[in-house]
């Protein structure tokens, strides 16, 4: 039931519109989509919100609305309008938020937005703006969003932009700016996120940051820099900056110095081939720092005071060895991916005892020590595959109670040691041509998927009679449960020649009713049959 | 209040090495280029260089590059100007200033003395 | 270099009066819209002292009795009424380039 007073107000509702109280006896008015070409004529004094959206309107007479002294949110977005009036918004004292977006503008309105001391909000991206008029927001004193995005701007209008000292978020992106001058921010102390995404720049003046003290996020993706954005030195309190898909080669040393509080850097998806070794120091705050590709780097770089690490991707490089010290700057690594190097020899990494996931696939690495992997409680995965290991001390992997993912395919292995792998799920032992030797399967009890390096061992895990088809299926089913790893033995591979043929296949008969489900690959049939284990034992 | 606080007069011999200090209190010291000034004996302003103590970048003047260097110390908010061969022509006051909006000189240190007489 | 020449080279003012002193530099201080003078105040012993920078924005805490304008290459200072205690020297400095420049001051006395 509406009060008297709410009755009242409703009795103002434009015709087809859609009215309601917004709770402080003022009217909420939605017009929006109606077809409508020019505004309603009887709105009530007591408007504070009108939404004039998706209409047909494309002009707006002087002072076309009188008295709504309080009017606080306007909505004229997805019209035609080409011009705007002075005087179009005359008397709306209370106005905060003007929403101009998707309309046919040629440049910012300058009269009409005149003298709107309350506006703090306003909306013009997505019109056909190429000019801003020097003077234009000179009278808005208040304003704290601006949305300047999708429109024609080829240059900063540095000189409009003077008077926005109280400007928190500003929006320049898709636009076709090609150059950032020095200071052309320079007295915007109080903004806070600036996205300049989806233009053409490709240079930056070396101060054109200079002012932004308050700046936490910078979006320059999606540009055509080609030398690191240095000016970003001055801006002490960045939280997140983004210049992927740009043009840059190298990240100089020290680059991010000025800069101690980033939490994110997105640079993906640019040439980079030269990182100085100091460029990531003290970020104190960043999480994650992913580089593909950079060939050029040959050290792995130095990464004092950005202690907070918990992943750290470098592939594609030509780095040879890890310092031994490296867990001690990195002591909440969780991942770490280092393939595609030139990896000869390990440090040990018990010290990142935080660790989940190790990549150091297509490296050089030829041994692993007893101490290289202990006590990496945490770890889930560990991938191995494509170096020249030849040699694993027996009880490398003893103290890895969590390991359920472990591929040392394609290396130089004779012998596999089992100790501490009982909680595998997903192993993959395939190109290591020397590994002849039979499998028990009693050392995996929780196995799901193998790969092995000749068909006949597979006969092992119960794949006798159907051939079993391994989709990509390596990197699922990483949920199980860890609850009973500890209590699982662990022991070595038995060297199946010792045995009498028939003793093994009465074993392999248990063994098959057991392990039902495992998947192993290759899969034994007509050309790669169980019996090829028969060709050693024959002759005796 | 930001301030800057500069070391005190300094007398030395040509040839001479000598260091001068500017410590900033008050402000992000990092967020914002230190600039060194000179005024030799009733003569005007003239800009030597400035670092921007966050990340040690800095410009020079290049009638003055090779013959002094402008360091940072972050960590006790202090900026320094240094000498490894002093000349008489060095006598002059030396003044720190803080950037402000859009380049200018917004903040100044009271200055430091040099002179440099054999 | 850009050289800034500033004129006159002294000036005596009774108080009240308008004093208006010019600076020319060798070369335009504009850049995207931005003219890059500003304005200082030197009195004896004492370090200089911000008054107008971009040309005509008053610094906080100076009076507006002083004003900046110009672009280009010519800039003027002007401080109208003139009061006893603005005896000082005047700069002008441009930072359009580096190295930055000054002009090689103007004396004001108050007659």
């Known amino acids: 039931s509406s009060s008297p007073r709410s009755g009242a107000l409703l009795r103002g509702c434009p015709t087809h519109c859609h009215c309601e109280p917004d709770g402080r006896m003022l009217l909420r008015v939605d017009c929006s989509d109606l077809g409508l070409s020019e505004l309603p004529s009887n709105l009530s004094v007591f408007t504070s919100y009108l939404d004039l959206s998706m209409n047909n309107i494309s002009q707006l007479l002087p002072n076309p609305l009188p008295s709504l002294r309080f009017l606080e949110e306007l909505r004229l977005a997805g019209n035609a309008l080409t011009y705007i009036p002075k005087g179009a918004f005359t008397g709306l004292y209370s106005l905060k938020v003007l929403m101009l977006q998707n309309n046919q503008l040629r440049q910012v309105p300058t009269e009409a937005l005149q003298n709107l001391r309350s506006l703090q909000s306003l909306r013009l991206d997505a019109n056909h703006i190429s000019y801003v008029p020097p003077s234009c927001f000179s009278g808005l004193h208040s304003l704290r969003h601006l949305w300047l995005d999708d429109n024609a701007l080829t240059e900063i209008p540095v000189q409009a932009f003077r008077s926005l000292s109280a400007l928190q978020a500003m929006t320049l992106a898709l636009n076709k700016i090609h150059h950032i001058p020095d200071y052309a921010f320079g007295n915007l102390s109080s903004l806070v996120v600036l996205h300049l995404h989806n233009n053409r720049i490709h240079s930056l003046g070396k101060k054109c940051f200079d002012g932004l003290h308050s700046l936490e996020t910078l979006d320059l993706n999606y540009n055509n820099l080609d030398e690191f954005p240095t000016a970003i030195r001055t801006l002490s309190n960045l939280k997140e900056l983004g210049f992927h898909s740009n043009n840059i080669r190298s990240i100089p040393e020290k680059a991010f110095v000025g800069n101690p509080s980033l939490i994110t850097i997105h640079f993906y998806d640019n040439p980079i081939q030269f990182v100085g070794r100091s460029a990531f120091q003290h970020l104190p705050e960043l999480r994650t720092l992913t580089l593909n590709g950079a060939s050029q780097i040959t050290e792995f770089p130095d990464l004092t005071g950005t202690a907070n690490l918990e992943s750290l991707t470098l592939t594609g490089a030509q780095i040879s060895s890890l310092p031994q010290t490296v867990c001690n700057q990195l002591p909440n690594l969780q991942v770490l991916d280092l393939s595609y190097n030139l990896l000869e020899d390990l440090p040990s990494f018990s010290v990142c005892q935080k660790l989940q996931k190790i990549d150091l696939r297509h490296n050089e690495i030829y041994e692993i020590k007893v101490d290289t992997f202990q006590q990496l409680l945490s770890l889930r995965s560990l991938n191995l595959a494509w170096n020249k290991i030849a040699i694993i001390h027996p009880n490398a992997f003893s103290t890895l109670p969590s390991l359920i993912k472990l591929d040392l395919s394609s290396n130089l292995l004779s012998s596999f040691p089992v100790t501490g792998l009982h909680g595998l799920t997903h192993l993959k032992l395939t190109g290591n041509h020397a590994l002849q030797s039979l499998i028990s399967s009693e050392n995996f009890p929780e196995l799901k998927i193998i790969e092995m390096p000749y068909a006949y061992q597979c006969c092992a895990f119960g794949v006798c009679e159907n051939a079993y088809k391994i989709s990509n299926q390596w990197n699922k089913g990483d949920n199980s449960s860890m609850d009973d790893l500890h209590k699982k033995d662990a022991g070595m591979f038995q060297v199946q020649d010792e045995r009498d043929l028939e003793d093994f296949l009465l074993d392999f008969e248990e063994d098959l009713k057991a392990l039902h489900s495992v998947q192993c690959s290759p899969s034994p049939g007509p050309f790669k049959p169980c019996e090829h284990l028969l060709d050693g034992w024959l002759i005796r | 209040e930001v301030q800057l606080v500069q070391s005190g007069a300094e007398v030395k011999k040509p040839g001479e090495s000598l260091r001068i200090s500017c410590k900033g209190s008050?402000?992000?010291?990092?967020?914002?280029?230190i600039e060194w000034v000179r005024q030799a004996p009733g003569k005007g302003l003239e800009w030597i260089g400035e670092?921007?103590?966050?990340?040690?970048?800095?410009n020079y003047n290049e009638k003055f590059k090779g013959h002094v260097t402008i360091s940072a110390d972050k960590s006790i908010s202090t900026a320094y100007l240094q000498w490894s061969s002093l000349k008489a022509s060095d006598t002059a006051v030396y003044y720190c200033?803080?950037?402000?909006?859009?380049?200018?000189?917004?903040?100044w240190g009271q200055g430091t003395l040099v002179t440099v007489s054999s | 270099d850009i050289v800034l020449t500033q004129s006159p080279a002294s000036l005596a003012v009774s108080p009240g009066q308008r004093a208006t002193i010019t600076c020319r530099a060798s070369?335009?201080?504009?850049?995207?819209?931005?003219?890059?003078m500003h304005w200082y105040q030197q009195k004896p012993g004492q370090p200089p002292k911000l008054l107008i920078y971009?040309?005509?924005n008053l610094e906080s805490g100076v009076p507006d009795r002083f004003s900046g304008s110009g672009s280009g290459t010519d800039f003027t200072l002007t401080i109208n009424p003139v009061e006893a205690n603005d005896a000082a020297t005047y700069y002008c400095?441009?930072?359009?380039?580096?190295?930055?420049?000054f002009g090689g001051g103007t004396k004001l006395e108050i007659k």
């Open positions: 670092i921007l103590p966050g990340s040690d970048s800095t």
């Open positions: 400095q441009q930072n359009a380039e580096d190295p930055r420049t």
């Open positions: 200033a803080r950037s402000g909006l859009y380049g200018s000189s917004q903040y």
């Open positions: 070369e335009s201080v504009d850049s995207y819209g931005n003219s890059f």
């Open positions: 008050g402000y992000s010291f990092t967020a914002y280029w």
């Open positions: 971009l040309t005509s």
